[in-house]
Amino acid sequence: FPMFKRGRCLCIGPGVKAVKVADIEKASIMYPSNNCDKIEVIITLKENKGQRCLNPKSKQARLIIKKVERKNF
């Protein structure tokens, strides 16, 4: 993708406050790294409707992060 550079966050802007649960295919959490200094919550939408960034400060994002961390650790 020509405009995509290393050292960039994946989300442009703060993100949406919420996504309908029924529309969520999967949720990915990107933790702060050399590429991006903030946590990012990326939602893949069902029916090939692309991806959306969820505002990591939102209630829904905090719930997702908690759920994923519980699952992983």
Epitope: I43, G50, C53
Partner: nanobody, 126 residues
Framework: EVQLVESGGGLVQAGGSLRLSCAAS????????IGWFRQAPGKEREGVSC????????YYADSVKGRFTISSDNAKNTVYLQMNSLKPEDTAVYYC???????????????????WGQGTQVTVSS
């Protein structure tokens, strides 16, 4: 009511400059990514540039890199596209659009945007 209004288009000679404005109302640009797109007659709409006003991140299509500069004024709720060294192939209708929750890989995908302006015509003569 949400509205995006573009202005600043016009007729300019090759090598000249124009500054487009995109004035937003009904929402705060700080909460959104604002993108500029263009559509030339008989061609597909293409993404030109994108900005996150919340952190100042800017993105450009290869075709305009080094010639166009995107910026924002949060107090005026307006995004600008400064276009220098214009070429005849830059002739198009230029649109601004707003997206929330935009992912970098989809920044120039039209369906990712929630709101669109009506466009402003830019004509570059040789």
């Amino acid at each position: 009511e949400v509205q995006l209004v573009e202005s600043g288009g016009g007729l300019v000679q090759a090598g000249g400059s124009l500054r487009l404005s995109c004035a937003a109302s009904g929402f705060t640009i700080d909460d959104y990514a604002i993108g500029w797109f263009r559509q030339a007659p008989g061609k597909e709409r293409e993404g030109v540039s994108c900005i996150s006003s919340s952190d100042g991140s800017t993105y450009y299509a290869d075709s305009v890199k080094g010639r166009f500069t995107i910026s924002s004024d949060n107090a005026k709720n307006t995004v600008y596209l400064q276009m220098n060294s214009l070429k005849p192939e830059d002739t198009a209708v230029y649109y601004c659009a707003a997206a929330q929750g935009l992912v970098v890989t989809e920044m120039f995908v039209g369906r990712s945007y929630d709101y669109w302006g009506q466009g402003t015509q830019v004509t570059v003569s040789s």
